[in-house]
């Protein structure tokens, strides 16, 4: 079955936007005016995942690029990466678990928990211009809350 998707941008709770930093990394920084056009547009796909009342399984691809955020172990640590896929086969309803994030939404604030690594979240640093990463703590220094803005298809 074709997967249902929508286009969006994400900003962290400090209003930092996400932009490409090299071919396989995202970073978070404050953007204004015309610079806002640099922010990445995600294709958020609604995929199969474990049944839960407050978690919606999604995959986060970069719009019109064959890149998806994925979670893998690197040096024994859960790590966020951008992974290249075959565009003929993605997105799909049954995404591999490393591509799946549980979207948790409370009062229009979104968290993205790795399905592969429970309690690890897409995170940004307080500091400007730092990589987006997978963090194992919530409510600490690092930021795990995001807002979503729809982008016209």
């Amino acid at each position: 079955a074709p997967v249902r998707s929508l286009n969006c941008t994400l900003r962290d709770s400090q209003q930092k936007s996400l932009v490409m930093s090299g071919p396989y990394e995202l970073k978070a920084l404050h953007l204004q005016g015309q610079d806002m056009e640099q922010q990445v547009v995600f294709s958020m796909s609604f995929v199969q995942g474990e049944e839960s009342n407050d978690k919606i399984p999604v995959a986060l691809g970069l719009k019109e690029k064959n890149l998806y955020l994925s979670c893998v172990l690197k040096d024994d640590k859960p790590t966020l990466q951008l992974e290249s896929v075959d565009p003929k086969n993605y997105p799909k309803k049954k995404m591999e678990k490393r591509f799946v994030f549980n979207k948790i939404e409370i009062n229009n604030k979104l968290e993205f928990e790795s399905a592969q690594f429970p309690n690890w979240y897409i995170s940004t640093s307080q500091a400007e211009n730092m990589p987006v990463f997978l963090g194992g703590t919530k409510g600490g220094q690092d930021i795990t809350d995001f807002t979503m803005q729809f982008v016209s298809s």
């Epitope: 929508l6 286009n7 049944e51 999604v58 309803k93 229009n108 729809f150 016209s152 298809s153």
Partner: antibody
């Protein structure tokens, strides 16, 4: 509270067009799909299509492509469905409904329905 | 298109009875299944979504369950206001499709 208020009943001649409106209040318009459903007299429910006002995404039932055109005006929190080239078999009650953008909540709220009668 | 085969098409029951209505999907719908109640001349009313989650304000005598591609709506103890027509809906795949309806009548 959430409300979906639809425009009033219409009587149209075959070949004419009609535009049904669905004005919503009580929630963030852009974040919910507006669904359109029809019910012919004495019959069941049939899905026509949907629009996500936040990004203009529209999905149609193939059966209604060319018959229904769905739009939304975010400045007035109103969705519209225009039906063209009306025929007697388009006589039905047309409903709008809502579903959260991530599809999790089902068709939770419904408008009161708009009866469209096509008669010469 | 996904077919939703709803049964029975009509059902007579008495106040206090336990009633079950079934929808069978022609393929996997990933639990994107809702149930609605409709009374004559009124808009449908949402009862249950994602198979078993009750919409706010819906009495707990209504419940939903699933086994494979079979989905069931149960009313544990019928009340006078429950006599109506019930529809299931799959909203997993376009076009979304409804069951043909079950008319629940007073015996």
């Amino acid at each position: 509270q959430v409300q979906l208020v639809q425009s009033g009943a219409e009587v149209k001649k075959p070949g004419a067009s009609v535009k049904v409106s669905c004005k919503v209040s009580g929630y963030t318009f852009s974040r919910y799909w507006i669904e359109w459903v029809r019910q012919a007299p004495g019959k069941g429910l049939e899905w026509i299509g949907e629009i996500l006002p936040g990004d203009g995404n529209i999905n149609y039932n193939e059966k209604f492509k060319g018959k229904a055109t769905i739009t939304a005006d975010t400045s007035t929190d109103t969705a519209y469905m225009e039906l063209s080239s009306l025929r007697s078999e388009d006589t039905a009650v047309y409903y709008c409904s809502t579903i959260y953008y991530d599809y999790d909540q089902g068709f939770t709220y419904w408008g009161q329905g708009t009866l469209v009668t096509v008669s010469s | 298109d996904i077919q939703m085969t709803q049964s029975p098409s009509s059902l007579s029951a008495s106040v206090g009875d336990r009633v079950t209505i079934t929808c069978k999907a022609s393929q996997d719908i990933d639990r994107y299944l809702s149930w609605f109640q409709q009374k004559p001349g009124k808009a449908p009313k949402s009862l249950i979504y994602r198979v078993k989650r009750l919409v706010d304000g819906v009495p707990s005598r209504f419940s939903g369950s699933a086994s494979g591609t079979d989905y069931t709506l149960t009313i544990s103890s019928l009340q006078p206001e429950d006599f109506a027509t019930y529809y299931c809906l799959q909203y997993d795949e376009f076009p979304y499709t409804f069951g043909q309806g079950t008319k629940l009548e007073i015996k």
